[in-house]
């Protein structure tokens, strides 16, 4: 996988009035990295490893950069000529990547009320937009506004590609190995269900990065998606992740079912415990 830096900025307007606060989240290599609070923007490392990468003395620069981007986005939202009543959001997502062969990719995406309406390849400067008439209207509004502000266009939007890559390289050079791998702890539990069925749940926790395969197999063959229920892959607050998958099986057939886990090239299978380990809360209620 390439190294990546992802900025997610969101600004809001209420009844046509753009709010002064904004929210910025930064992900480094897919890991939550920085967070700018809505009302006061202070770059906050998410967990010890992010602190190691940034170092205290760089927080001011992060804060300054993110605050500037937030102001730009607020101005952009103010110029969107859409219905003004109620709550509206404008979101800008910027992503840059450095691949193993040293090639780079950068892109920028705008969302209005959660709907994508404009994208730009920051390397080729090529703009794309969805086919819907609403998206096209919004896209024209924003592009016209960006063209009007030639200085901003030059210094901000066209420089974003280089800035993002520069920041990413700076983080990668910091000496902290972001490509660390923390294997998951996997445990399987069972809970009584009804009519001779039991629910078996396989939980994986404490793993990094977040990409994981977790599924139930019967006789070595994957069960179909609609016979399994998955939990989201969620941060556990320690810079690692957790998730689960559950399925319902016939009591007495436990030995035929295994939980398959694959993470960062490693894999393992986990049987259903034979004893009656009761779990009061079932994911299948």
């Amino acid at each position: 996988e390439p190294h990546s830096l992802r900025y997610n900025l969101t600004v809001l307007s209420w009844d046509g009035s753009v709010q002064s606060g904004f929210l910025t989240e930064v992900h480094l290599d897919g890991q939550p990295f920085l967070r700018c609070d809505r009302q006061k923007c202070r770059a906050k490392p998410q967990g010890q490893w992010a602190e190691d990468v940034l170092g205290n003395k760089t927080w001011d620069r992060e804060t300054r950069d993110l605050t500037g981007n937030g102001k730009d986005l607020r101005m952009t939202l103010a110029h969107i000529k859409d219905q003004k009543e109620g709550l509206h959001s404008l979101q800008e997502i910027r992503v840059c990547e450095i691949h193993e062969d040293n090639s780079t990719r950068s892109s920028q995406h705008f969302y209005y009320d959660g709907e994508l309406f404009l994208s730009q390849n920051l390397e080729t400067k090529e703009w794309t937009m969805p086919q819907s008439s609403r998206a096209q209207t919004l896209a024209m509004n924003v592009r016209n506004f960006l063209k009007e502000d030639a200085m901003k266009t030059k210094t901000h939007y066209h420089a974003m590609h280089a800035d993002c890559l520069q920041e990413l390289r700076r983080y990668l050079k910091s000496g902290v190995v972001l490509r660390r791998t923390v294997p998951p702890m996997v445990n399987v539990t069972r809970s009584e269900a009804s009519e001779g069925n039991i629910t078996v749940t396989c939980r994986a926790s404490g793993f990094y990065p977040w990409n994981i395969t977790l599924s139930w197999r019967q006789d070595g063959v994957s069960l179909s998606h609609d016979t399994q229920q998955w939990g989201d892959v969620l941060p556990d607050g320690n810079g690692t992740y957790q998730t689960w998958v559950a399925t319902r099986i016939c009591q007495g057939e436990e030995q035929r079912f295994t939980c398959y886990m694959e993470h960062s090239g490693n894999h393992s299978t986990h049987p259903v415990p034979s004893g009656k380990v009761l779990v009061l809360q079932s994911h299948w209620q």
Epitope: Q218, G220, V221, Q255, P271
Partner: antibody, heavy 122, light 106 residues
Framework: EVQLVESGGGLVQSGGSLRLSCVAS????????MNWVRQAPGKGLEWISY????????YYADSVKGRFTISRDNAKKSLYLQMNSLRDEDTAVYYC???????????????WGQGTTVTVSS | DIQMTQSPSSLSASVGDRVTITCRAS??????LNWYQQKPGKAPKLLIY???SLQSGVPSRFSGSGSGTDFTLTISSLQPEDFATYYC????????FGGGTKVDIK
Amino acid sequence: EVQLVESGGGLVQSGGSLRLSCVASGFTLSRYSMNWVRQAPGKGLEWISYISSRSSTIYYADSVKGRFTISRDNAKKSLYLQMNSLRDEDTAVYYCARVSDITGNTGSFDIWGQGTTVTVSS
Amino acid sequence: DIQMTQSPSSLSASVGDRVTITCRASQSISSYLNWYQQKPGKAPKLLIYAASSLQSGVPSRFSGSGSGTDFTLTISSLQPEDFATYYCQQSYSTLTFGGGTKVDIK
């Protein structure tokens, strides 16, 4: 003796239908997931469909999706393959095969039928 | 779909030879790989499951190895009854067979 016996093969016109059956003996069919695998003349094996022991999970190969339907009747110890809109390229020997339930298995087929021949002519 | 590529597609060998057949998956399939033997006019027979586990009743001269994308079936000392076609099969993502390797007499 543990065995699977297929039937229902034969000559059919292109666009026609055929229903294959596979009867199990010597073991409890309801405990096992089952498959249909075919082999065109002079060619390799092609897996075409899978059905889990309680019919809750069914898979098809892309080549037959939307045309073939796998089903089972555990009480009758039978597995079925309903084949519609048959094409020339469906000409093959069709095998039913049982998925092993040995601990640590990986979707392997431990018991196979002798096969039934389906010939589709245009 | 995951593609399974076997090599060679055919090979000639003599009784007593050590024979190696390889199977490569188009993406990682962990150890969800099985090997079968098929003789003309007969149904296939399971030899190896889970990449390296010998099926009950199969002679110990057959062995399997590998994990991820590259797998090997080895016959340590080829016997007359081993001349047949061998297939690999994955079950990591639904099920697919390799194209087969025909082992005939040199």
